[in-house]
């Protein structure tokens, strides 16, 4: 939802969290603001306190329940409002009718581990976190490997077009330190975006055997 120089963007993690960012040029830093969530067909509502993340933007997380509980369904619509205190009253600064499963951003994959490492290859696995069972196998992943002397931005992206929670990295250099990251995205949702990148997993390939051609 955009009003002039105001921007209000929210994403659902598919289970029990809606994360929102509100930015407003010229807004006072010390103003107390909240996000209010009112589902159209549920008995609960939820509020979170917007906290500054930069000069003109604030963020908060609406915690809807325990992390793995399915608090919203594909047919829910949630009215989200930014409310700011002006003296003794609250003023509505932004509003949107939010379709949770059209605005998805999953949690970053977790539990990255090296399953098997060789001189030129490394097999890595991971798990998805707090992802709805609604998606079945209809998820995709992107992965990247940080090589010595390069930055993450330079790392080529590898795409996994199905729910495959492992990868076999090939053509690696022996006895070399690497880092690996992965992120996930459901196919569902017009405004769905990639999860944050996972925490990097550091690993080292095995040295080449002495006296053998590599």
């Amino acid at each position: 939802a955009v009003n002039g120089t105001s921007r209000f963007t929210c994403f659902y993690n598919s289970r029990a969290n809606i994360s929102c960012v509100w930015s407003q040029d010229g807004a006072l830093q010390d103003t107390s603001c909240q996000v209010h969530a009112w589902p159209d067909r549920r008995r609960w509502n939820q509020t979170c306190e917007l906290l500054p993340v930069s000069q003109a933007s604030w963020a908060c997380n609406l915690i809807l329940g325990t992390p793995d509980s399915q608090k919203l369904t594909a047919v829910d619509i949630v009215t989200l409002r930014v409310m700011c205190r002006e003296g003794v009253r609250w003023r509505m600064m932004a509003i949107q009718d939010f379709k949770p499963f059209e605005n998805l951003r999953l949690m970053a994959p977790i539990s990255l581990q090296v399953v098997h490492v060789e001189t030129h290859r490394c097999n890595i696995s991971w798990k998805i976190s707090q992802a709805s069972h609604y998606f079945e196998r209809h998820l995709e992943f992107e992965a990247r490997t940080l090589s010595p002397g390069h930055t993450w931005e330079e790392a080529p992206l590898m795409t996994l077009k199905q729910k495959q929670e492992w990868i076999c990295l090939e053509t690696l250099t022996p006895d070399t330190q690497y880092e690996f990251q992965v992120r996930v995205k459901p196919l569902q949702g017009e405004f769905t975006t990639w999860s944050p990148w996972s925490q990097p997993l550091a690993f080292r390939t095995k040295p080449a055997a002495l006296g053998k051609d590599t």
């Epitope: 509980s69 399915q70 369904t73 594909a74 047919v75 499963f101 059209e102 069972h133 609604y134 998606f135 079945e136 209809h138 196919l187 569902q188 017009e190």
Partner: antibody, heavy 117, light 107 residues
Framework: EVQLVQSGAEVKKPGATVKISCKVS????????MHWVQQAPGKGLEWMGW????????EYAPGFQDRVTITADTSTDTAYMELSSLRSEDTAVYYC??????????WGQGTTVTVSS | EIVMTQSPATLSVSPGERATLSCRAS??????LHWYQQKPGQAPRLLII???QSISGIPARFSGSRSGTEFTLTISSLQSEDFAVYFC?????????FGQGTKLEIK
């Protein structure tokens, strides 16, 4: 292998109630949404509703919500659809299906229900 | 309720030729459109999701595309087993609705 096996054909009188079962295997029933779809001769495919086996929550299409009840028994991996106050236009093939909320990945073989006096 | 209109109602094509089936939504549904195939006496089978994503195990000759509210299912080179009824289905607004079907028959 994913399998959904439905109960057999039914003949009912107008005003009666029918209950169809759908026994599943080959996947984790508790992680599934189980759907029911009607295919009547002149009306095509109509989505009746679903149940989330994880939490028992149901969603019914407005055209059916007054007469349909969908349940799931996680101890036997079986979903049920009960349709009450039957009328002649309910004569149809009824399918159970598994999928996320948005589309139906696997289907049962169908159960024919005939409503006739 | 969103109305899905499929055209043509019947399509006659020779084996080996290309078939193009159309599905139009009565309002904007983003890419929330899925295709099924149904053969006589059988349940429908999911072919394509989100307008263009093929389901694993479905032959590569089946493909989908979208232009606004108009969606197209293309079968590049028809095999004998492809002659069936094809349904589209929207999942943008509940209740989710199906098109009335296109019957693909042998010419």
């Amino acid at each position: 292998e994913v399998q959904l096996v439905q109960s057999g054909a039914e003949v009912k009188k107008p005003g009666a109630t029918v209950k169809i079962s759908c026994k599943v295997s080959g996947f984790n029933f508790k992680d599934s949404l189980m759907h029911w779809v009607q295919q009547a001769p002149g009306k095509g495919l109509e989505w009746m509703g679903w149940i989330d086996s994880e939490n028992g929550e149901t969603e019914y299409a407005p055209g059916f919500q007054d007469r349909v009840t969908i349940t799931a028994d996680t101890s036997t991996d079986t979903a049920y659809m009960e349709l009450s106050s039957l009328r002649s236009e309910d004569t149809a093939v009824y399918y159970c299906a598994r999928g996320g909320p948005w589309f139906l990945s696997y289907w049962g073989q169908g159960t024919t229900v005939t409503v006739s006096s | 309720e969103i109305v899905m209109t499929q055209s043509p109602a019947t399509l006659s094509v020779s084996p080996g030729e290309r078939a193009t089936l159309s599905c139009r939504a009565s309002q904007i549904i983003s890419n929330n459109l899925h295709w099924y195939q149904q053969k006589p006496g059988q349940a429908p089978r999911l072919l394509i999701i989100y307008g263009l994503q093929s389901i694993s195990g479905i032959p590569a000759r089946f493909s989908g595309s979208r232009s606004g509210t108009e969606f197209t299912l293309t079968i590049s080179s028809l095999q004998s087993e492809d002659f069936a009824v094809y349904f589209c289905q929207q999942s943008n607004n509940w209740p989710y609705t199906f098109g009335q079907g296109t019957k693909l028959e042998i010419k």
